[in-house]
C-alpha cells in the first residue's frame, strides 16, 4: 500500500529516510536539458537492492543511438559497482533484509527526488544548523494504515534557536515534563483523523500516475 501525501514538516527541522522499505518507488527525474531513458522510468526497492539504475541523457539530438545502447549495456556493470561505493557502513544502518539504502547519485538527476513510500516506512528528523531539539518523544514519522487510509504519524520534535535553548529548558522544567499525546483509540470515527492534515503542496498518490508516464 502506497502512502498518501508526504511526511509532515517540522519547523526548523529536516527529515529523510535512512533506509527504504521493500516496494518503495523512486521516479527517475532529470534536471533541465536532460531526459531519462525511455526504459528507465523508475527504480523499485526489491529485497535490499534497487531494481535498476536511473540514467539521464542530454536532450540535444546529436547523441547517437549507439551511445544510448552502450549506456544500457553498462547497466548491469553499474549495478555491481553501486555496492562498492560505500566503504563504511554506520552502526545504525546495516543492510537490513527488505530495506534498500539511498541510491547513489546519478549524472544530471533532478535536485529533488520523488519517492513513493509504502506503509511502514519511517523518516527521521533532525534540527537544522542553528537550532536545538526539545524532544518529547521519538523524532520519527511512520506511515501507518488507519481506518483503511495511510497517513504519517506526528514526530515528537520541537526545534528552537540554540541561543534560546536554555530558556525553553528552564520553562519546561518549571511546568513539569508534559507527556506526548498518547496513541488514539482504535475506533474509526467518520469525522476525525489521527493523522496531521497534509499541506496543499504535499504530493498525492495521483501524481504518481502522471509522473510515471514517460515524458
Amino acid at each position: 500500500e502506497l502512502c498518501l501525501y508526504d511526511p509532515p514538516e517540522v519547523p526548523n527541522a529536516t527529515f529523510k529516510a535512512l533506509s527504504y522499505k521493500n516496494g518503495t518507488i523512486l521516479n527517475c527525474e532529470c534536471k533541465r536539458g536532460f531526459r531519462r531513458l525511455k526504459e528507465l522510468v523508475y527504480m523499485r526497492c526489491l529485497g535490499n537492492s534497487w531494481s535498476s539504475n536511473c540514467q539521464c541523457t542530454s536532450n540535444s539530438h546529436d547523441k547517437s543511438r549507439k551511445q544510448v545502447t552502450a549506456q544500457l549495456e553498462h547497466q548491469k556493470e553499474q549495478q555491481t559497482t553501486t555496492d562498492m561505493q560505500k566503504p563504511t557502513q554506520s552502526m545504525h544502518q546495516e543492510n537490513l533484509t527488505g530495506h534498500c539504502r539511498e541510491p547513489p547519485p546519478w549524472k544530471h538527476e533532478d535536485s529533488k527526488r520523488i519517492y513513493h513510500f509504502v506503509e511502514g516506512q519511517s523518516v527521521h528528523y533532525e534540527c537544522i544548523p542553528g537550532y536545538k531539539a526539545l524532544q518529547r518523544g521519538p523524532a520519527i514519522s511512520i506511515c501507518k494504515m488507519k481506518c483503511g487510509k495511510t497517513g504519517w504519524t506526528q514526530p515528537q520534535l520541537t526545534c528552537v534557536d540554540e541561543r534560546e535553548h536554555h530558556r525553553f529548558l528552564a520553562s519546561e522544567e518549571s511546568q513539569g515534563s508534559r507527556n506526548s499525546s498518547p496513541e488514539s483509540e482504535t475506533s474509526c470515527p467518520i469525522t476525525t483523523t489521527d493523522f496531521p492534515q497534509p499541506t496543499e503542496t504535499t504530493a498525492m498518490t495521483e501524481t504518481f500516475v502522471l509522473t510515471m508516464e514517460y515524458k
Epitope: T14, D110, S111
Partner: nanobody, 130 residues
Framework: QLQLVESGGGLVQAGGSLRLSCAAS????????IGWFRQAPGKEREGVSY????????YYINSVKGRFTISSDNAKSTVYLQMNTLKPEDTAVYYC???????????????????????WGKGTQVTVSS
C-alpha cells in the same frame, strides 16, 4: 557511474597550506551536501567539513575551524578545501563524499557526523611534517 575524484594532497611542512579539490562531473550539486572526511592511521574516519549545494551552508569539525575553508564551484562541479596553518595532526587520507539533502533542501550536521554517505571518493594523502 558518477565518481568523485580527489586531488591536491601531498607533503607539506607544519604551518603550510594545501588546497584539495573534489571533481564530481555530472553531480546535481543542489541536491547534496558535499565535503570531506579524513582518516588518520589507526583512527576512525571523521567528517571534517561540508557545504550544501542548495544554499551554501557550511560545517566544520571544531579542530579545523578558522584554519580550513570549504567552497564550491557548481559550474565546474568541484568542491575545494583550503587548508591553512596545517598541523602534524592533520596528517590523514582525505576523502571526498556526498550525502543527499533532507526535506526542503536542508541538511543536518548529525547526518554528516554519522559517516553514512551516498558516495565516496578514493582519497588523497595529506602529510604534514613537523
Amino acid at each position: 557511474q558518477l565518481q568523485l575524484v580527489e586531488s591536491g594532497g601531498g607533503l607539506v611542512q607544519a604551518g603550510g597550506s594545501l588546497r584539495l579539490s573534489c571533481a564530481a562531473s555530472g553531480l546535481t550539486f543542489e541536491g547534496y551536501a558535499i565535503g570531506w572526511f579524513r582518516q588518520a592511521p589507526g583512527k576512525e574516519r571523521e567528517g571534517v567539513s561540508y557545504i550544501t549545494g542548495s544554499d551554501g551552508t557550511t560545517y566544520y569539525i571544531n579542530s579545523v575551524k578558522g584554519r580550513f575553508t570549504i567552497s564550491s564551484d557548481n559550474a565546474k562541479s568541484t568542491v575545494y578545501l583550503q587548508m591553512n596553518t596545517l598541523k602534524p595532526e592533520d596528517t590523514a587520507v582525505y576523502y571526498c563524499a556526498v550525502d543527499r539533502l533532507g526535506s526542503q533542501g536542508r541538511y543536518a550536521s548529525a547526518w554528516w557526523r554519522s559517516g553514512d554517505m551516498d558516495l565516496w571518493g578514493k582519497g588523497t594523502q595529506v602529510t604534514v611534517s613537523s
